[in-house]
């Protein structure tokens, strides 16, 4: 066996998305000879790691290796052995680790160090683990969906490869909702990006893009809920919190120490006369919506217009792909259809939140109660964020497309991240004419 096994004429790449609530491993595959063509990379596997996000391992770093084992073993099964040593592995950690780093750089470094050591024990080309910035998360999400939609291709097609794709080369905006942060990224129409921190310039396939992006740390759905609870408990008269964002009859005890564990609730922190409080659901969409709006400071804006908290936001332009938790939550609520208007979504949310908890548990017996209990809040939060936070209207709502996958690949930042790190998105249009997408469909 003295010859290197002939590699297949395909290549593979692995990206681990170390999010705040969980870690997912994605395996991508592409034809080796078409690396610079647009739209040739596709996802062949997603493996969700059992357990919480890596930031939760801060007191038990020795368990990280075992935590990653199943999905890394899955990668060994999916990718041919002859390709293992040439397959790059990247881990990007997002807002959960950004928050941990805010609390303690040393603890965040320790977690990443153990993650790196665990991943380098596998026979892949491990390229490192790092905390990506919110700006990167937004940018790579935007690259992913536009790459998959074929927006970077210079060939205008007469057919559509996905239902919501227009035939023009106008890029889609990207709306990403995680557990700890949310990102909005799009190309504004002839608008100066007034805040340099929110401006990105790309040259992709011979075309220049001036992109706006912002990541709102602490405004992912899980951290937004912690913020709302911390805000509302301030004015509670005792250790009972009657909460409109949970179904009538729902009860849950919350430790005050857990509430104030995250940097996201620091602004609401106060000394409370109790160590625990009980959430009692009352299931009222309108009141829940009002409570959520109090998390968005819209009274201050140093620019021509803002989203919230004094962050510049240009006028919305074009179509948007809303993915990650935007999609998962709306999919659960059966609200992802293009035909459902914003008014209809609001009506359905009102009905859903008002349903008694016992009835909800019976209707969705297969869903874990922890997740099930939070869909009323999450759905209401999504509406509040999109309408009041980002200024979508009933009319522009139809430009939001809730996307899970495009062409079999998950919408999210991981594909864009890998395309960038493997230099698979050239600045200039490749000399050889890329094949029509019909070749890959």
């Amino acid at each position: 066996t003295q010859n290197k096994a002939l590699p297949e004429n395909v290549k593979y790449g692995i990206v681990l998305d170390a999010g705040s609530s969980h870690t997912s491993l994605y395996i991508y595959k592409w034809p080796a000879e078409k690396e610079n063509d647009t739209g040739v990379v596709h996802q062949v596997e997603e493996c969700r790691v059992k357990g919480p996000g890596i930031s939760k391992f801060v007191q038990k770093v020795n368990e990280i290796g075992i935590y990653l084992t199943d999905c890394m073993e899955r990668a060994r099964e999916v990718i041919p052995r002859s390709q293992h040593q040439e397959t790059p592995v990247y881990l990007g950690a997002t807002a959960g680790m950004r928050l941990l780093r805010m609390e303690s750089e040393e603890l965040a470094d320790r977690v990443l160090d153990v993650v790196e050591r665990s991943l380098s024990n596998y026979p892949f080309d491990f390229q490192g683990a790092r905390i990506i910035t919110g700006q990167e998360e937004g940018a790579y999400g935007w690259i992913t969906i536009n790459y998959l939609l074929g927006k970077f291709s210079q060939k205008t097609r007469w057919f559509s490869i996905v239902p919501y794709e227009t035939n023009n080369q106008e890029t889609f905006g990207a709306l990403d909702l995680g557990g700890a942060s949310t990102q909005v990224t799009f190309v504004p129409q002839n608008q100066t990006i007034e805040s340099p921190d929110n401006a990105l310039q790309f040259r992709l396939y011979g075309k220049d893009y001036n992109v706006y992006t912002h990541s709102f740390l602490c405004y992912g759905k899980d951290q937004a809920l912690w913020q709302k609870l911390a805000k509302d408990i301030q004015v509670a008269s005792n250790e009972i919190l009657r909460d409109p964002c949970f179904h009538p009859g729902y009860k849950k005890v919350v430790n005050v120490s857990d509430l104030y564990k995250t940097p996201c609730t620091k602004r609401f922190e106060m000394t409370l006369p109790f160590q625990q409080f009980e959430i009692q659901g009352i299931g009222n969409y309108q009141q829940c919506h009002q409570s959520i709006l109090e998390l968005f400071n819209t009274s201050y804006c140093p620019y021509s217009q803002c989203a919230f908290n004094g962050i510049f936001l240009p006028p919305l332009q074009g179509d948007f792909g809303a993915f990650s938790a935007f999609y998962f939550v709306m999919k659960f609520l059966n609200l992802t259809s293009e035909k459902v208007s914003q008014e209809k979504v609001t009506e359905m949310m009102k009905k859903f939140c008002a349903q008694p908890w016992e009835e909800i548990k019976t209707s969705y017996a297969g869903v874990k109660e922890k997740y099930l209990s939070e869909y009323c809040f999450s759905g209401t939060y999504i509406l509040s964020l999109l309408l009041q936070g980002y200024h979508f209207t009933a009319d522009s709502w139809e430009h939001i497309h809730f996307i899970g996958k495009i062409q079999g690949s998950d919408a999210g930042w991981t594909l864009g991240y890998m395309l960038n790190l493997t230099n698979m998105i050239p600045a200039e249009q490749p000399l050889s004419t890329p094949l029509s997408h019909s070749t890959y469909v």
């Epitope: 003295q2 290197k4 096994a5 052995r81 002859s82 293992h84 040593q85 026979p123 491990f126």
Partner: antibody
Framework: EVQLVESGGGLVKPGGSLRLSCAAS????????MNWVRQAPGKGLEWVGE??????????HYAESVKGRFTISRDDSKNTLYLQMNSLKTEDTAVYYC????????????WGQGTTVTVSS | EIVLTQSPATLSVSPGERATLSCRAS??????LHWYQQKPGQSPRLLIY???QSISGIPARFSGSGSGTDFTLTISSVEPEDFAVYFC?????????FGGGTKLEIK
Amino acid sequence: EVQLVESGGGLVKPGGSLRLSCAASGFTFSKYWMNWVRQAPGKGLEWVGEIRLKSNKYGTHYAESVKGRFTISRDDSKNTLYLQMNSLKTEDTAVYYCTTQLDLYWFFDVWGQGTTVTVSS
Amino acid sequence: EIVLTQSPATLSVSPGERATLSCRASQSISDYLHWYQQKPGQSPRLLIYYASQSISGIPARFSGSGSGTDFTLTISSVEPEDFAVYFCQNGHSLPLTFGGGTKLEIK
């Protein structure tokens, strides 16, 4: 012809240091993960450690028994693998083999002839 | 660490007989198990990789089988030059480990 030739073995006192070299020829050295395996007199084989490629930032992994004392390095321009052994113990006495896998990974289809290291006072 | 246990420690056979060597792993290693032959004063030589994959230049009488935790090296008809020590090796995960060896001797 694919060949690995070890050198640098010898007699050393406990606590002393020694540096072994392995000269590779007949294959593109820089493209392959390289390993050291040792065999104590009359005993079985023991993996010492590995070094990966430049693209892997020359990542190294070691057996627990040598961690912190032994260092594997490589010089791709000289087609040479090294094993720096510090704080040597009598139990490090062994024949040290330089080895690689020219197919796939983590098995060894090419072995050197070995070099003997004796740690004794 | 994956521990490999080889049995028997010594196997006595006559030339022409079938020899069966066993290797057991402390946890499942799929088919990531390799077999080596070592003769006195020589370096080990790879015989079988990934439990059952044969190598060009190695006589067809050597075959491997097994998956998970139990593996077997079989020599269908032992030749005089086969008397040696045989080692199995975990190629699944670091640290890489070897079995203690089985000495194949003439009966």
